[in-house]
């Protein structure tokens, strides 16, 4: 069923783009017939096109009526600069180019799978790493912190580079870099734990280049619902890669009889994927799918980009909402398996764990659920948004808000159900995570709508930085700290071990509700910010003298 939905969504997206092309051809014909006096049909940001009447914009998810910016044919009217030479004037692209774009998106998604596979392979063999290097829990925390911090610091740098230099070269170099570092780290001797820490930091830098730049290439290859679909596929790579990482880690370790080999799988695949990116991913111009390929000559400074992003309310609120998602997923991913194990101890269906790993079975089940709900969430979110776009222009942030608020309810119910039924708790986790993950691709799409193409990599980077800083960089530790604080004020018993962690985890649904509020705030400004982005893109398409970004 899901596969059918995906197929129909893909087909629908392709049909929609074909229809767009046909509409553009008709408009050009009408304009030529009218002696060229009408406003030209160039597409704006995310595919904005102006009808002959001048009051309807073909946006990414439908059409918006607007007041004309000037009488038809007025010099400087947005969209008129590229009547003859712009992509809008070109003949329809051959089918092979569509296939090429599909292949490029597939390779980029595969790269994202490997990004997360690599990250979670280490998580899958973390206990073996701890055992081998004699790493204490604080040392394991250091490995995680160094990775996230280096990722956070590197993301804005790659955002800057991604908006200014050849993106596929940066992508490939990033993959080659983290592949080489991960492969090398499998040979680190027992006494050099600090080298392992350094290697995780370097991998964080390599992976930041990918996570920051790859979505912007997809944004430049597709528009409208096709872009939503492709971003959905790209972001589905997160749970898929994470799940495969755990599986790869444990299965390779068992097959080879040595955990070191687990760290040698993703680098080999990474090198292949990096090469494929160089070969198959076209060197798209920023704004290419938005029909602005050759026109985006204007370059703004990084400082101006940052100011523009901070003033972009839809971007700011959606970034804060993403941080809330990150906070919850980080905390739940770390603590839920142990919480469920403690629940079973209280229910007398499991023994108190004195020798870690505690809740290994629960970790496995939770990992499988996360993998599946990631897929289901992305598909559901994309499908719901696609349907809601027919009803409202604010569909994207509203679907996200509903998903978040619904998720908060089910996350709350986890703690109610866990007291009496582990199966009930797993059902709540399933529904809660599906709803929580439904906004992954949509959030990326929101960013594509409200941020101009030449700023997208910086925007993705800043959002990534924010979501890690306010989200999963601190949430696992905060939950552990609160749990310990509660436990210190109560008597030492399995019941209070369970309850204290449960009470601490109750912070998650509150943060998720806050995230839902941020998405509702995004909905308030979404239409105006999107229109502003389209207008700015049209201004960027004009001669430099008239550019005001």
């Amino acid at each position: 069923m899901m596969c059918l939905e995906c197929a129909s969504a893909a087909a629908g997206g392709a049909e929609e783009e074909e229809a767009d092309a046909e509409r553009r051809r008709r408009r050009r014909g009408a304009q030529r017939g009218a002696g060229g006096s009408g406003c030209c049909g160039a597409r704006g940001a995310g595919g904005a096109g102006v009808s002959a009447a001048g009051d309807e914009v073909q946006t990414l998810s439908g059409s918006v009526r607007r007041a004309p910016t000037g009488p038809p044919g007025t010099p400087g009217t947005p969209g008129c600069a590229a009547t003859a030479k712009g992509p809008g004037a070109q003949q329809p692209k051959p089918a092979s180019l569509g296939r090429g774009r599909g292949a490029a998106a597939a390779i980029l998604s595969l790269g994202n799978v490997l990004n997360y596979l690599d990250r979670y392979t280490v998580a899958g063999v973390l206990l073996d790493i701890q055992q081998h290097f004699g790493v204490k829990d604080r040392g394991a925390g250091l490995l995680q912190s160094v990775f996230i911090c280096s990722f956070m610091v590197a993301a804005p740098i790659f955002g800057y580079l991604g908006d200014r230099f050849n993106r596929k070269v940066i992508l490939s170099c990033g993959i080659f870099f983290w592949s080489a570092v991960t492969f090398s780290s499998s040979f680190i001797a027992q006494q050099y734990f600090w080298l392992l820490v350094l290697s995780r930091g370097l991998v964080g830098i390599g992976e930041a280049s990918y996570s920051t730049i790859a979505p912007t290439i997809i944004g430049d290859l597709f528009t409208k619902n096709t872009r939503t679909l492709m971003l959905s596929v790209f972001y589905f790579a997160i749970p898929l890669g994470s799940g495969l990482g755990y599986i790869t880690g444990s299965s390779v370790k068992q097959a080879a009889g040595d955990w070191h080999w687990a760290l040698r799988v993703s680098p080999v695949l990474g090198m292949i994927t990096g090469t494929l990116i160089l070969i198959l991913v076209p060197a798209t111009k920023r704004g290419h799918a938005d029909q602005l390929g050759d026109q985006l000559k204007a370059r703004t400074s990084w400082l101006r980009d940052m100011k523009a992003l901070i003033r972009n309310r839809s971007y700011v609120f959606s970034s804060l909402a993403t941080s809330a998602v990150s906070f919850a997923t980080g905390a739940l991913g770390m603590w839920i398996p142990l919480y469920l194990h403690r629940a079973q101890v209280v229910q007398k269906t499991a023994e108190t764990c004195n020798s870690p790993p505690c809740g290994a079975k629960d970790s496995l089940i939770f990992g499988a659920i996360t993998c599946f709900t990631g897929f289901l969430g992305v598909v559901t979110g994309a499908g719901a948004t696609r349907w809601c776009r027919l009803k409202t222009q604010r569909a994207d942030p509203l679907v996200c808000a509903v998903g978040m608020l619904g998720s908060a309810i089910f996350i709350c119910l986890i703690f109610v159900a866990a007291k009496s039924s582990i199966v009930g708790a797993y059902i709540c986790i399933f529904v809660g995570e599906t709803l929580l993950f439904s906004n992954w691709a949509i959030t990326a799409d929101i960013l594509m709508y409200v941020v101009i193409p030449t700023r997208r990599a910086t925007a993705v980077a800043l959002q990534s930085f924010t979501s890690h800083l306010l989200g999963d960089a601190g949430s696992p530790y905060l939950i552990g700290f609160i749990s310990d604080l509660i436990r210190q004020s109560t008597k030492d018993s399995p019941l209070w071990e369970f309850l204290s962690l449960g009470y601490a985890l109750m912070l998650c649904p509150f943060v998720v509700v806050l995230g839902g509020m941020f998405f509702l705030a995004t909905a308030l400004f979404f239409v105006s910010d999107r229109a502003r982005a389209e207008q700015q893109v049209n201004q960027l398409a004009m001669p430099p003298a008239s550019v005001k970004v």
Epitope: Q130, Q131, H132, F133, G134, V135, K136, D137, R138, G139, L142, A189, Q190, Q191, F193, V197, N354, S355, P356
Partner: antibody, heavy 125, light 107 residues
């Protein structure tokens, strides 16, 4: 100065129990991994058990030959490590050394940088 | 379990000579090998860690080398206090294991 002093050894009958104690001083005990190593008369060294610090959930590891019979534990407030030996056998006769693992805050070495003077345990009927 | 084999079991030398003691692992263990000296009626003491890293307070005549499966403890110009039993220990994986020892005696 690092000091490790073992007590609690003696002569016991097969099948009986004995608890060894190791008092420590001169270092931050709560952050340090501790082990017991034994040496049968005229034989080589054999690692018995390891207990990690509280930052590693006080995880314990045992040699296969004593698993299920011996239990290692620690009391951070007293800076002591213990070895509870149950169902003792003749082949458990040995000098038992309390050992310290070198600590590096984030991680620990599995080798033994300090050894106690040892305590003799004799299992005989 | 990783098995360590030490050779020779006994080595007879005269003071002032230089000697090499061998330790072989049943599988590759990188540099996770450590050397201990146990004098008669004394507790063991750590000489070398991680195959070649020296220990504070240990005379510089003791040195270690090797990687993978073959390791060497070298004593440059043996002194009278060096006549004792030498053990290698692996920490590559649990359980921690020791070699059977090499006894260094006066020729």
């Amino acid at each position: 100065e690092v000091q490790l002093v073992e007590t609690g050894g003696g002569l016991v009958r097969p099948g009986s129990s004995l608890k060894l104690s190791c008092a420590t001083s001169g270092f931050t005990f709560s952050d340090t991994w501790m082990s017991w190593v034994r040496q049968a008369p005229g034989k080589g060294l054999e690692w018995v058990a390891l207990i990690k610090d509280k930052n590693s959930n006080s995880e314990a590891n045992y040699a296969e030959s004593i698993k299920g019979r011996f239990t290692i534990s620690r009391d951070d407030s007293k800076s002591r490590v213990y070895l509870q030996m149950n169902t003792l056998r003749d082949q458990d006769t040995a000098t038992y050394y309390c050992t310290r693992h070198e600590d590096f805050y984030y991680y620990s070495g599995y080798y033994f940088d300090y050894w106690g003077q040892g305590v003799m345990v004799t299992v005989s009927s | 379990d990783i098995v360590l084999t030490q050779s020779p079991p006994t080595l007879s030398v005269t003071p002032g000579e230089s000697v090499s003691l061998s330790c072989r692992a049943s599988q590759g263990i990188s540099t996770s090998i450590h050397w201990y000296q146990q004098r008669s009626n004394e507790s063991p003491r750590l000489l070398i860690k991680y195959a070649s890293q020296s220990i504070a307070g240990i005379p510089s005549r003791f040195s270690g080398s090797g990687s993978g499966t073959d390791f060497i403890l070298s004593i440059n110009r043996v002194e009278s206090e060096d006549f004792s039993v030498y053990y290698c220990q692996q920490t590559y994986s649990l359980p921690l294991t020791f070699g059977p020892g090499t006894k260094l005696e006066v020729k």
